[in-house]
Interface confidence: medium
């Protein structure tokens, strides 16, 4: 089946620094979502993109509009509360109903 490759699997940042998470898709995707997992294990939706970029505070997400084969999540001025696990998920263009998840990025922000 279609696959989502998320990188890096783990990331340590110092408070106040910037970084980016990336997801590569083995086929063209119709849309992409970025989530953050809360302490109870529930997923909080950060972004939903069908193309282009979206920004929310210190977070910015982009989805390659041409090839539709990758997406990035940029974190600016990382704060301690940004620590957690981030997931991307993509919806296949085939319309077969499947949302396919990346394996997650464990982000640790250090003081």
């Amino acid at each position: 089946g279609d696959q989502v490759e998320q990188s890096p699997s783990a990331l340590s940042l110092h408070e106040g620094t910037d970084s980016a998470l990336r997801c590569n898709f083995t086929t063209t995707m119709r849309s992409v979502q970025w989530f953050r997992q809360n302490s109870r294990g529930s997923l909080i939706s950060l972004f939903y993109l069908a193309s282009g970029t979206k920004e929310n505070g210190r977070l910015k997400s982009a989805f390659d509009s041409k090839e539709r084969r990758y997406s990035t999540l940029h974190i600016r001025d990382a704060q301690l509360e940004d620590s957690g696990t981030y997931f991307c998920a993509a919806e296949a263009s085939s319309g077969s109903w499947q949302l396919i998840f990346g394996s997650g990025t464990q982000l640790t922000v250090m003081p």
């Epitope: 069908a50 919806e91 077969s96």
Partner: antibody, heavy 113, light 106 residues
Framework: QVQLQESGAGLVKPGASVKLSCTAS????????MHWVKQRPEQGLEWIGR????????KYDPKFQGKATITADTSSNTAYLQLSSLTSEDTAVYYC??????WGQGTTVTVSS | DIELTQSPAIMSASPGEKVTITCSAS?????MYWYQQKSDASPKLWIY???NLAPGVPARFSGSGSGNSYSLTISSMEGEDAATYYC?????????FGGGTKLEIK
């Protein structure tokens, strides 16, 4: 947050039609596919079909062809399921879903005279 | 249509017990998806692509299988696992579901 809210059900008479709506928030339905699933009381799940709201293309399980009609209105960000010639077999909870992650809470149709 | 048969239809397990639910396909499928549904709630994606746990699903769950035979396993049953589990195939339209397995806690 992505949310799907179904409405439009209730008690309907045999032979009548009903139109269920599924209003989306947190995303544009034209960027995805919208699906409908049926669940009869104490029974399993049945995929009815889906629509590509960007162009109106639909795909159905053949057993729901003629019974179900899926449409969408991108201006109101809403997908619809119309069920015709209702019988007791159509008594069920109907769910709309985006991909297989985001599901509505379900809406109940009860067919009874 | 590809028919999916789940077994058992109903089962109960004690806390700590290992649980296996099987899903048998009438034709070979490429992979299987699993959902958990609790009473009066919408189904939740639980396992995708046969063996990948959806985010937030406890590690005691696992999925395996190929061809015509797939399974969902709980290594050590917990009270919160009591629910109905459905398998679903995406190999051939229409996307069919299994009849469900109702798992109860003893």
């Amino acid at each position: 947050q992505v949310q799907l809210q179904e409405s439009g059900a209730g008690l309907v008479k045999p032979g009548a039609s009903v139109k269920l709506s599924c209003t989306a928030s947190g995303f544009n339905i034209k960027d995805t596919y919208m699906h409908w699933v049926k669940q009869r009381p104490e029974q399993g799940l049945e995929w009815i079909g889906r629509i590509d709201p960007a162009n109106g293309n639909t795909k159905y399980d053949p057993k729901f062809q003629g019974k179900a009609t899926i449409t969408a209105d991108t201006s109101s960000n809403t997908a619809y399921l119309q069920l015709s010639s209702l019988t007791s077999e159509d008594t069920a909870v109907y769910y709309c879903a985006r991909a297989n992650w985001d599901w509505g809470q379900g809406t109940t149709v009860t067919v009874s005279s | 249509d590809i028919e999916l048969t789940q077994s058992p239809a109903i089962m109960s397990a004690s806390p700590g017990e290992k649980v296996t639910i099987t899903c048998s396909a009438s034709s070979s499928v490429n992979y299987m998806y699993w959902y958990q549904q609790k009473s009066d709630a919408s189904p939740k994606l639980w396992i995708y692509y046969t063996s990948n746990l959806a985010p937030g699903v406890p590690a005691r769950f696992s999925g395996s299988g190929s061809g015509n035979s797939y399974s969902l396993t709980i290594s050590s049953m917990e009270g919160e696992d009591a629910a109905t589990y459905y398998c679903q195939q995406f190999t051939s339209s229409p996307w069919t579901f299994g009849g469900g397995t109702k798992l109860e806690i003893k």
